[in-house]
């Protein structure tokens, strides 16, 4: 790595959890002094080039599209920037995982995902997402729909023949709201995942704000009723005056 430059970013433009045979676009941060950018996959501590972009596109971030995702293409990726004949810079690494049934079928069964204490919580509360499976599982991964960052990974615990992992979201903020799924994986290939659990929607409701809205609505209704009452009184009085004359 050259000097004290910040490490360039690498990101998956969609989710880093890719369905079998799906595709993903990887973006490497443009480096002004680089004349080419290589996309490397890291397998067993060995770096292998799987893509290469020349410096044509000015300061545009080089992009790479990986099609027909499978277990061989899952793993850790890194952008390597060539800035001289023997001078390189490297990005951070990106983990891509593939989800779908493997041929051996050991990941065929989906895990289940549940939430404690409730799927609707207030900010500041503690929430636990519990991922479980009756089949052998080494690690569980938790991903949030639409999030480009890497999924959370936890080693599974064996509880009375059930494999499980507890993902703690504490304290909850509005950013935690969304749809979650969990996956099983085995240590033989940590980048290959089972099919996802059923989606779980976590609603982070700001009750203070909701109560304020409710109070505001109630006040508006009362005000409207008051206006209508005054109007009715006024109309009624006017009618009496007319009758008298």
């Amino acid at each position: 790595q050259e000097g004290d430059f910040p490490m360039p970013f690498i990101s998956a433009k969609s989710s880093p959890v890719i369905p079998l045979d799906g595709s993903v676009k990887i973006q490497c941060q443009a480096i002004r002094e680089a004349y080419l950018t290589q996309l490397m996959i890291i397998k067993n501590s060995t770096y292998r080039e799987i893509g290469r972009r020349l410096k044509f596109w000015n300061e545009t971030d080089p992009e790479f599209v990986i099609d027909h995702m499978d277990a061989n293409k899952a793993g850790r990726y890194q952008c390597q920037y060539r800035i001289g004949h023997y001078r390189f810079r490297y990005s951070d690494t990106l983990e891509l995982v593939v989800t779908g049934e493997e041929p051996a079928g050991r990941l065929r069964d989906r895990p289940s995902l549940s939430v404690r204490p409730s799927p609707s919580v207030a900010p500041g509360e503690n929430v636990t997402l519990l991922c479980q499976s009756g089949n052998r599982t080494d690690t569980f991964l938790l991903s949030k729909e639409g999030a480009a960052h890497r999924p959370l990974r936890l080693r599974s615990q064996d509880q009375d023949g059930w494999y499980q992992a507890e993902f703690s979201l504490s304290p909850v903020t509005s950013a935690h709201g969304g749809t979650y799924r969990c996956y099983r994986s085995l240590s033989t290939n940590p980048y290959l995942l089972s099919q996802p659990s059923e989606p779980l929607a976590l609603l982070v409701a700001d009750y203070t704000m909701q109560n304020l809205i409710r109070m505001g609505l109630a006040a508006s209704v009362l005000l409207l009723l008051g206006i209508l009452l005054c109007q009715a009184r006024h109309d009624h009085g006017g009618a009496r005056e007319a009758a008298r004359s």
């Epitope: 595709s23 893509g51 044509f56 992009e63 790479f64």
Partner: antibody, heavy 120, light 107 residues
């Protein structure tokens, strides 16, 4: 299934103009760089033009620079090649080709081609 | 520009044989050479890129080797459907350039 279908070829007089089109289907068009490659009557292949996936940047070899313009419409999944000041040496079969998502200058899908004849 | 010289321009072989086609670059292109197959009535097919990487879906009887300036396409256990025109192309630097092609006939 990836498909590229070229159209617009024909007979043009030297100095004339013509616009070729390529209709793409079966893939996310806006993710890929697209190119035109031609095959001369003596069966040689020549790269003619490339356009970046976003449609911002274009590249040409010196022999067509200033005469040919590549463009794309990502909303319609179409690629175009506007050719002007045509010469007899531009006579060729013109292919639309998709660049792979991983390497510049590498063409993983090609169309069937459309023929341009430049002759008086 | 990088000039690519392809040889032979014509080749005839029998089914089951192994054949080789060569390409030489006018300057070093590292490993960045691709091979394409052109068959009558079909669209051009990318066989090999980066010198030796087999494109997905291509039969394993096709293989590529070489780096620097000299490269080879090998087709082992030749099959009748391998009758085609074969082209090499450098994808190291602009402008992308192709070899002159090799016409392979099956005896």
């Amino acid at each position: 299934e990836v498909q590229l279908v070229e159209s617009g070829g024909g007979l043009v007089k030297p100095g004339g103009s013509l616009k070729l089109s390529c209709a793409a289907s079966g893939f996310t068009f806006s993710n890929y760089g697209m190119s035109w490659v031609r095959q001369t009557p003596d069966k040689r292949l020549e790269w003619v033009a490339t356009m970046h996936s976003g449609g911002t940047y274009t590249y040409y070899p010196d022999n067509v620079k200033g005469r040919f313009t590549i463009s794309r419409d990502n909303a319609k999944n179409n690629l175009y090649l506007q050719m002007s000041s045509l010469r007899s040496e531009d006579t060729a079969m013109y292919y639309c080709a998709r660049e792979t998502g991983l390497y510049d200058g590498l063409f993983d899908f090609w169309g069937q081609g459309t023929t341009l004849t430049v002759s008086s | 520009d990088v000039q690519i010289t392809q040889s032979p321009s014509y080749l005839a072989a029998s089914p089951g044989e192994t054949i080789t086609i060569n390409c030489r670059a006018s300057k070093t292109i590292s490993k960045y050479l691709a091979w394409y197959q052109e068959k009558p009535g079909k669209t051009n097919m990318l066989l090999i890129y980066s010198g030796s990487t087999l494109q997905s879906g291509v039969p394993s009887r096709f293989s590529g080797s070489g780096s620097g300036t000299d490269f080879t396409l090998t087709i082992s256990s030749l099959e009748p459907e391998d009758l085609a025109m074969y082209y090499c192309q450098q994808h190291d630097e602009y402008p992308w350039t192709f070899g002159g092609g090799t016409k392979l006939e099956i005896k």
